[in-house]
Interface confidence: low
Amino acid sequence: GCLTQLYENAFFRGGDVASMYTPNAQYCQMRCTFHPRCLLFSFLPASSINDMEKRFGCFLKDSVTGTLPKVHRTGAVSGHSLKQCGHQISACHRDIYKGVDMRGVNFNVSKVSSVEECQKRCTSNIRCQFFSYATQTFHKAEYRNNCLLKYSPGGTPTAIKVLSNVESGFSLKPCALSEIGCHMNIFQHLAFSDVDVARVLTPDAFVCRTICTYHPNCLFFTFYTNVWKIESQRNVCLLKTSESGTPSSSTPQENTISGYSLLTCKRTLPEPCHSKIYPGVDFGGEELNVTFVKGVNVCQETCTKMIRCQFFTYSLLPEDCKEEKCKCFLRLSMDGSPTRIAYGTQGSSGYSLRLCNTGDNSVCTTKTSTRIVGGTNSSWGEWPWQVSLQVKLTAQRHLCGGSLIGHQWVLTAAHCFDGLPLQDVWRIYSGILNLSDITKDTPFSQIKEIIIHQNYKVSEGNHDIALIKLQAPLNYTEFQKPICLPSKGDTSTIYTNCWVTGWGFSKEKGEIQNILQKVNIPLVTNEECQKRYQDYKITQRMVCAGYKEGGKDACKGDSGGPLVCKHNGMWRLVGITSWGEGCARREQPGVYTKVAEYMDWILEKTQSSDGKAQMQSPA
């Protein structure tokens, strides 16, 4: 299953399959997740080691048993791949690293006014993988405000150095934020020229394209079909690049298919997994296990659940079957692709779905309609779980926020439905940033069921929580995916990086905002909060957040939206915007429903009819 915990001051011994330099443990974890054989990783921050060569070292590891011995190493951080972790799987990495220079091939330099602009330039350059920016206080005047766009053979820095007044980061192309745009066309009977960066076997051009999209240096590809004239090249997928970023030439060639990486697509990227099953095809590879199962779909599920399994073949040969069950061959290889693909067999083959965003495990297991004051504009995909709950009566208007917690589930505040419990008047917009972008043609979700907490009472602040079941499940994208729920009764975690988002009023007597607003707000202890609200009981099922001096807060229209906190590189839904005395007033923190206290209720209500929970909190 999905294991998200990080081990501090621990290093996994042995099992190495690859190593690289990464700026932090989270990026190292992401590289592990996308590496076909990596199950575990260990990262050495600069502070943890004197050996300059090993500083920022990211060590990717595999283990037959799924675990390795841990040794104590001060400062080291270790953890698990996020394979099988559903929507948490993403190649998108937005962080900016201050005081760090990520080295690579510098292929472009320009003067810019901010690190954000530098990151944007990298994101809009087809070859840029990461960048470094020298700030205005950099010690050498001639380098100040320089934005260096970089790449490397593996897509990660060739070295990372601690350097004052330098800021580094990665391209946001994997966040589907590139302005370049992409070519969706597949070109039949056409072969591209240029440099081959890798060669893998795939059953079709679509798998080849997805592998190209997630390969650090692939910009385009050519696939040789299973009827290609040279037998040894059949089903070969050649991943390619060029100096210009586009093929320098193409040749008409029977039984070849070519196309482009989809990494530069805006607003949508393909999932990093392959769900199709190929009848009459055998995938060869190293045998992991053989098991008797009923049907090819169960075979694929079995492969997906066995974390080391990369692909499978389900045999229908009479000697491989007994009664209704047949042999399911679970396999793996060095590069995650079959070592042999055979056609015209009595088997069916396919891939593990461990890197799919959309599995069952897709969620990590006010007194007045309140309230973002003192916030700033959000950017695309920054808060992909945020939804807008709108009511369509004569006119249509935004009333509340909400958080996507599963394909078919939104969590919000119960008081949003005070006086409006009719499900057919509500429209739920997900994957949006600007309310003004909503037109009559914008797709929205309708409500199948509103589940208000049984102990909620109108005009009281207690149990201000409600679940919305959508009529149809949503697909996950970089702009529309769920937020992890906390563990039940999560009281030990100290959250220091918390944000509230919403389209609510920007001042107490204001109006709904067009662009989704965000504000960084510290949590306040319940004892401190209680002192500020003598009239109301601040229960253990509430959490408060705000600045003593006020000035930043949620406000009218933000109700039901998320209070999220980042811990160990993972965002969690800590609170639901509920109520407060006015907005952003001095010594009047916002009060939020504490989600951890309602985990039993959430899991009970979201149980599917077959008794399997549709969401789970992180391990």
Epitope: N455, Q534, Y536, T539, Q540, R541, E597
Partner: antibody, heavy 118, light 107 residues
Amino acid sequence: EVQLLESGGGLVQPGGSLRLSCAASGFTFSSYPMGWVRQAPGKGLEWVSRISSSGGMTIYADSVKGRFTISRDNSKNTLYLQMNSLRAEDTAVYYCARDDWNVGMDVWGQGTTVTVSS
Amino acid sequence: DIQMTQSPSSLSASVGDRVTITCRASQSISSYLNWYQQKPGKAPKLLIYAASSLQSGVPSKFSGSGSGTDYTLTISSLQPEDFATYYCQQTYTTPWTFGQGTKVEIK
């Protein structure tokens, strides 16, 4: 000395009305939520109603909802309970209490008796 | 509404005895539980708040414990002035509710 003193109890016929008062002294009345609790003869305690310190939020037990109204006058340091449509089952000793979320009902009055009988 | 069930309804004890009264809530009340003492003809008096915190001025022979749904009031050494009726009360969610009371009598 922190003190609460109820008044206004008495005998009333079913369907009648009564207004109870509770005078507070010895503490900053306007800073505390207040509540009413009653006790029928030979029975246990029953929570009746609560009002926030400013008077902006009121809560009632289902048994009295729509018939009783809690209010306060912070300038007079006084809490009130207006009781309408009284029934025999409303017969009880009515206590007013300071209702601090943090420490419960920490200050009580001596009680005033309400008898509803024909 | 949350139901509060006290047990026993009454008990007979001697001076010096250790007495325990339990209170069970129909759902978790997260330690939002208070204990009161009431003597005949008098107003109730707060003894314990938040399940285990001793109210100012209350002797330390009274103690409270518990979490979730189950709570206990203990009188370590019963004295003549402790013979009274004891009530638990939840303030987890409105309406506040009291237990039916436990009458502690002289054996």
